[in-house]
Amino acid sequence: IWELKKDVYVVELDWYPDAPGEMVVLTCDTPEEDGITWTLDQSSEVLGSGKTLTIQVKEFGDAGQYTCHKGGEVLSHSLLLLHKKEDGIWSTDILKDQKEPKNKTFLRCEAKNYSGRFTCWWLTTISTDLTFSVKSSRGSSDPQGVTCGAATLSAERVRGDNKEYEYSVECQEDSACPAAEESLPIEVMVDAVHKLKYENYTSSFFIRDIIKPDPPKNLQLKPLKNSRQVEVSWEYPDTWSTPHSYFSLTFCVQVQGKSKREKKDRVFTDKTSATVICRKNASISVRAQDRYYSSSWSEWASVPCS
Amino acid sequence: RNLPVATPDPGMFPCLHHSQNLLRAVSNMLQKARQTLEFYPCTSEEIDHEDITKDKTSTVEACLPLELTKNESCLNSRETSFITNGSCLASRKTSFMMALCLSSIYEDLKMYQVEFKTMNAKLLMDPKRQIFLDQNMLAVIDELMQALNFNSETVPQKSSLEEPDFYKTKIKLCILLHAFRIRAVTIDRVMSYLNAS
């Protein structure tokens, strides 16, 4: 058993049929010695008396808010949460496996630039009685500071019969140099509590590996005389690291109709303009990627051909 | 247009070209190592990230773009500020800090060159003959060093009398290649920046 926060404790349980469970001793936080009784949650049934209460925690029915009283007055609370371990593996029931970039990916993180600011998000089908707490650091043995905000519900989607909820959090490394060469990864730890179930999820990454620039901005078209070709120009996104001659991007320019199956024109360039063939009812799209370290491409920025 | 439009300095341009070749060569070599040593811990997640140049050179600091010298987090280990002699830049544009930057890059390359050559000698003794260093990568390191044109004492190639542990050597190769790729990215950024300045 360990303390998650004040008066909240996590009991780690090997979860299998007829498991013996864990013996837990609760102590009432009071100078009083006599006349103390214990109850669980809203029940008035007295579980025991005395300053300490010894319980055998085996299942979720044994978890919950234990309260010690004296003469009708509440002295203190202890909330017990369960963390299940099945076949040596901690449960991951609360969050959905996003399966990208690989299986057992529960947290996904992205950074728009090298400033040390990044966003992580996760998915769940649970809508109520759910809380998250996020901590982060650079390295684990001698951790350096990363400050994370509160996790917020950022999107709701309908997937078949189910509703899916996306939560996200923004974090900022306390003293980040955009030009630095990372040798210690960022560690992100998310504590998830659903009712009386506790789970924790972690992700470890280098900022350089989670870079995904914003789409290029100010796409403009200039038809070329006596030709079906069009010069398309754009600018670096505002959120990208500067100077741009140091943090350079490379671009992919594509002309395609509404359907992905339609034919297309595609060209890659390090410049902020390119010449392509425009077709009726097609769109010109441009996306960006770090020129020197191939992490993710940005989303497309598009303009219609006409 | 955000990128500075500058006529490439004829002195700088060869270094930009060589640094692009360097990044390409080390990336290819790393990819080859990952594929060949698939049963060894050779991915970015599996290895310890070590920098053989740590406390010996200060490339990131010495080559920091002027725009980032205002960032306190970038200045923690800087004794001096900003990014030459070397043949990469026309002499009119040289400055003490640029010289420091390019000489730091040269020292990096020299250290990695020695490490890679020592390692290759060991790998050539491996009866499995599983992996060797790409001669192209070694040649590209050499070309960039020549383009930088700094003179410094020759670092003797390390030789070891004990029987090499090929497993450890291959893991060290992965560690070195990952670190060198990261440094090659920095070198490429620096050359691009200098070329545009």
Epitope: R228, Q229, T250, R261, E262, K263, K264, D265, R266, V267, F268, T269, D270, T275, I277, R279, K280 | -
Partner: antibody
Framework: QVQLVQSGAEVKKPGASVKVSCKAS????????LHWVRQAPGQGLEWMGW????????EHAPKFQGRVTMTTDTSTSTAYMELRSLRSDDTAVYYC???????????WGQGTMVTVSS | EIVMTQSPATLSVSPGERATLSCRAS??????LHWYQQKPGQAPRLLIY???QSISGIPARFSGSGSGTEFTLTISSLQSEDFAVYYC?????????FGGGTKVEIK
């Protein structure tokens, strides 16, 4: 599967014209760009131009401007390349090639040998 | 127009050996570079597109790399069916242009 079948070999006199055909099958004809590439005996490949069968748009290499006409007949899924004012150095194998992507060539015809000789 | 130069013109390699073919562009073409194989009396066949992207059905021993002005096609272990002429082609700008080819012959 996607296939391009070209017309047979031709022998032409200098100054004459030649029209090579390329019949597509195994895909919707208007879904791919069509290119013409030629190869002189023992020489390399030379791109001549492309046509979009959907709208008839074409683009030619400057070298062939005014001397080449590329057309398509969507009813028969056939592309044609006509080269006029033939010279002896036009002697080559002429290939049609197709792709959903405009700038490279995924599927090739078997080639048509055109000999220009007096 | 962009001029593509391939080297060497002829490469003599023993079966099972590694072959490295080079292609250089007269100006930077990013990764807009494609490789083809042509056997005598046959049409060319696409091997690699956009410098390094592999094509399904093409053996994994063929790989491409490079960007800017310098590109490489590598055949990791030459098989008898790989002896042919290899062409690079740029798609950075029109007119599309090919290199002069590299003939890979049996040593």
């Amino acid at each position: 599967q996607v296939q391009l079948v070209q017309s047979g070999a031709e022998v032409k006199k200098p100054g004459a014209s030649v029209k090579v055909s390329c019949k597509a099958s195994g895909y919707t004809f208007t879904d791919y760009y069509l290119h013409w590439v030629r190869q002189a005996p023992g020489q390399g490949l030379e791109w001549m131009g492309w046509i979009d069968p959907e709208n008839g748009d074409t683009e030619h290499a400057p070298k062939f401007q005014g001397r080449v006409t590329m057309t398509t007949d969507t009813s028969t899924s056939t592309a044609y390349m006509e080269l006029r004012s033939l010279r002896s150095d036009d002697t080559a194998v002429y290939y049609c090639a197709a792709n959903k992507e405009l700038r490279y060539f995924d599927v090739w015809g078997q080639g048509t040998m055109v000999t220009v000789s007096s | 127009e962009i001029v593509m130069t391939q080297s060497p013109a002829t490469l003599s390699v023993s079966p099972g050996e590694r072959a490295t073919l080079s292609c250089r562009a007269s100006q930077s073409i990013s990764i807009n570079l494609h490789w083809y194989q042509q056997k005598p009396g046959q049409a060319p066949r696409l091997l690699i597109y956009f410098a390094s992207q592999s094509i399904s059905g093409i053996p994994a021993r063929f790989s491409g790399s490079g960007s800017g002005t310098e590109f490489t096609l590598t055949i990791s272990s030459l098989q008898s069916e790989d002896f042919a002429v290899y062409y690079c082609q740029q798609s950075n700008s029109f007119p599309l242009t090919f290199g002069g080819g590299t003939k890979v012959e049996i040593k």
